[in-house]
């Protein structure tokens, strides 16, 4: 689709005559039709396949055309077409006289011819005017022609349409050759797709509009190519998002854990013991005469209760003193100014003379002892049972009960509570004091993993203690924000545990 | 072949929201926007926005922005409508497209929402 | 709002020539794009900015655009023409999206 322009300029018949060779009366009253047809070697009369069009009367005799851009007498004269322009033409122009004041040139008679001149050949679109002039006995025609697409069209032969635009469905310019060119910033087959800030990650980023960089959930940074570790992971690192590889040195679920804590900050005091291990990350042994977590309390000297025979001990500056019951002496009371005619054995114990009856011992029955058989034994004096055990007399013996997760004798042995695979759909397990927690993959909940996440991942109110719960990018992931105090991917771990 | 899969018919009371599915395969996803268009009974097809499934960009037809989301999940191929505060003019049939340089060249097969008290 | 209006109806014998015309103020600068739905069907694309043809759509069916006028020309209506179209563009800005009316062709 195009439009031939043809520019009419200068027309001259000085003795203003017709073709016929008849004089106008009072002069020529020029007015112009125009013939564009397909390229004929030979032009012939015929329908104008490209076009046609009439001038009103533009001068007399000779005269000079000028422009003009709207109304009657436009000029240049514009002859649209709606095909693809096939790069060669003919055109007759011819010039005739109208005798009278009607300016409507169809009324003209058939023998008012001034001069016709034809052109054939080939012609380029182009915005450059080709111009030209014809000469002949009696006349001369100057003109300039020139083929343009119409808007919207573009090519060598104005059929390639184009039609640019810059809203959501594209941005683009065309090109002359009618091709799209994208506006800065925007790529795709229609340019409809944003060119992200350079070096944004391809996977991980993603952007809305030119030279941003949006980060997909689990990654950060200005080129979104840092991952997020673990909420609450303290000492470590992620080579894929949510992950914590602990740093040397470090240990536990969210690398919380000095795996040397003893030589980074010596807690142990008084010449105590340290290592590398209990809950806190270290343990510390005290010497005889100390307590305490970090063996930071000296025992009073009579802890370890010296005084015999119910003689009451006094701490004294670096030593202690037993205050003897009457019939007893001694430094710890352990003499004894009693003989068995004193009966002095409690709860059935037996006396037996000692020294030639200057002296006892106390033969005491079972669950009795003392020098006087005046203490009833408690077995569980010691703190016999390990692990938090609850010591227990019974008779002659006595037992301990476990707490739950251990088990022996003294309640030593550890019970793992995932060796019996408690996790459903691939959880991992975690042995905690109070049973075994599971941590769940993508798609499944529940304390053991068992129920199968259908559509919101956040429904089933994955999160613990409180922990507020988002869904990912797909509907099956969510992540959880956990309140102070926990960590873990579901905030089901207190700080502190390991 | 590219096909697009809607979700079934929905009957839903006026003032509660609706969401319809768009389930898209044989092709790449991400390349291509989603449109969505409507048409009541008897009446003329009505557009009611586009989203881009590459980066969630949106555009909403004027009349519904209020009340219309769309939404695309890359990681199943899946974009998304959901229009809240029902009426009874809203009773029509849903239907998503796949958009290339404004052109709509695969339709899904349309999804009945009736809204009726 | 922006507007395409479109005759709610066009008649035709099978074997004439069917126009559909489609005008809004922004077809000279913004595609025209038509749409063929058939009774309790999807609508197809047959033709693409103004005057494209998909592949797959019969060669009768031509597009063209002049001034703020699109017209859709089924050349040599079949039976199976019979069916409502659609025309959809964008306004100026290229925010509002709309369908014309839609125009039902009755090939009798």
């Known amino acids: 689709s195009g439009i031939f322009q043809l520019r009419l300029q200068e027309f001259v018949n000085q003795r203003g005559m017709l073709a016929n060779g008849q004089s106008c009366e009072p002069g020529c009253r020029t007015f112009f039709r125009i013939c564009l047809k397909h390229f004929q070697a030979t032009f012939s009369e015929g329908p104008c396949t490209f076009g046609n069009v009439s001038t009103p009367v533009l001068g007399t005799n000779s005269f000079v055309v000028r422009d003009k851009n709207s109304g009657s007498g436009r000029n240049p004269l514009q002859l649209p077409f709606n095909f693809t322009w096939p790069g060669t033409f003919s055109l007759n122009i011819q010039a005739w006289h109208t005798p009278g004041d009607d300016l409507r040139p169809e009324t003209s008679p058939g023998n008012s011819l001034i001069s016709q001149i034809i052109i054939q050949g080939s012609l380029a679109v182009g915005k450059i005017w080709r111009t030209d002039e014809q000469n002949d006995t009696l006349t001369r025609l100057s003109y300039s022609y020139r083929v343009i697409c119409s808007d919207n069209y573009y090519g060598e032969s104005c059929s390639r349409l184009c039609k640019k635009r810059d809203d959501h469905f594209g941005h683009y310019e065309c090109q002359p050759d009618g091709s799209l060119s994208c506006l800065p910033g925007w790529t795709g087959k229609y340019c409809d797709q944003p060119i992200c800030l350079s070096g944004c990650h391809e996977q991980n980023g993603y952007c809305s509009k030119p030279d941003e960089c949006i980060c997909r959930p689990g990654w950060q940074g200005r080129l979104c190519n840092e991952c997020i570790p673990h909420n609450g992971c303290r000492h470590g690192t992620c080579s894929i998002p949510w992950q914590c590889a602990c740093d040397e040195g470090w240990g536990g679920l969210f690398c919380d854990q000095d795996l040397n804590y003893c030589t980074h900050h010596s807690p142990c005091k008084n010449g105590s013991t340290c290592s590398n291990s209990g809950p806190k990350g270290y343990t510390c042994t005290c010497l005889p005469g100390y307590t305490g977590e970090h063996c930071e309390l000296g025992l009073s000297k009579c802890a370890s209760n010296p005084c015999r025979n119910g003689g009451s001990c006094k701490d004294q500056e670096n030593s202690y003193h037993c205050l003897c019951p009457p019939g007893y002496y001694g430094q710890h009371c352990e003499h004894s100014t009693l003989t068995c005619a004193d009966s002095p054995c409690f709860n059935g114990g037996s006396c037996r003379e000692r020294n030639q009856g200057s002296s006892y011992a106390c033969e005491c029955p079972p669950n009795f002892t003392g020098s006087n058989c005046e203490k009833k034994v408690d077995r569980c004096t010691s703190n016999p049972c390990a692990n938090g055990g609850q010591c227990q007399n019974r008779g002659p013996s006595r037992t301990c009960r476990c707490r739950p997760g251990f088990t022996g004798t003294h309640c030593e042995l550890h019970i793992s509570d995932c060796a019996r695979s408690p996790c459903a759909h691939g959880g991992t397990c975690h042995d905690l004091e109070n049973g075994p927690v599971c941590t769940c993959p993508a798609g499944f909940s529940g304390r053991r993993c068992e129920v199968r996440i259908t559509h919101d991942a956040c429904a089933s109110g994955p999160c613990f203690n409180g922990a507020t719960c988002y869904t990912g990018l797909s509907p099956n992931n969510f992540v959880c924000n956990c309140p102070y105090g926990f960590v873990g991917s579901r905030c089901e771990f207190p700080v502190g545990l390991p | 072949q590219v096909l697009l899969i809607q979700s079934g018919a929905e009957v839903k009371k006026p003032g509660a929201s609706v969401q319809v599915s768009c389930k898209a395969s044989?092709?790449?996803?991400?390349?291509?926007?989603v449109i969505w268009v409507r048409q009541a009974p008897g009446q003329g097809l009505e557009y009611m926005g586009w989203?881009?499934?590459?980066?969630?960009?949106?555009n909403y037809a004027q009349k519904l922005q209020d009340r219309v989301t769309m939404t695309s999940d890359t990681s199943t191929t899946t974009a998304y409508m959901e229009l809240r505060s029902l009426r009874s003019d809203d009773t029509a049939v849903y239907y998503c497209?796949?958009?290339?340089?404004?052109?709509?060249?695969?339709w899904g097969q349309g999804t009945l929402v009736t809204v009726s008290s | 709002s922006y507007e395409l209006t479109q005759p709610p109806s066009v008649s035709v014998s099978p074997g004439q020539t069917a126009r559909i015309t489609c005008s809004g103020d922004?077809?000279?600068?913004?595609?025209a794009y038509w749409y063929q739905q058939k009774s309790g069907q999807a609508p197809v694309l047959v033709i693409y900015?103004?005057?494209k043809r998909p592949s797959g759509i019969p060669e009768r069916f031509s597009g063209s655009s002049s001034g703020t006028m699109a017209t859709l020309t089924i050349s040599g209506a079949q039976v199976e023409d019979e069916a409502d179209y659609y025309c959809?563009?964008?306004?100026?800005?290229?925010?509002?999206?709309?369908f014309g009316g839609g125009t039902k062709l009755t090939v009798l």
């Open positions: 497209a796949r958009e290339l340089g404004s052109s709509f060249d695969y």
């Open positions: 044989g092709y790449t996803f991400t390349n291509y926007g």
């Open positions: 989203i881009s499934a590459y980066n969630g960009n949106t």
């Open positions: 922004a077809l000279p600068k913004k595609y």
């Open positions: 900015e103004d005057i």
């Open positions: 959809f563009s964008t306004d100026n800005s290229g925010d509002h999206s709309v």
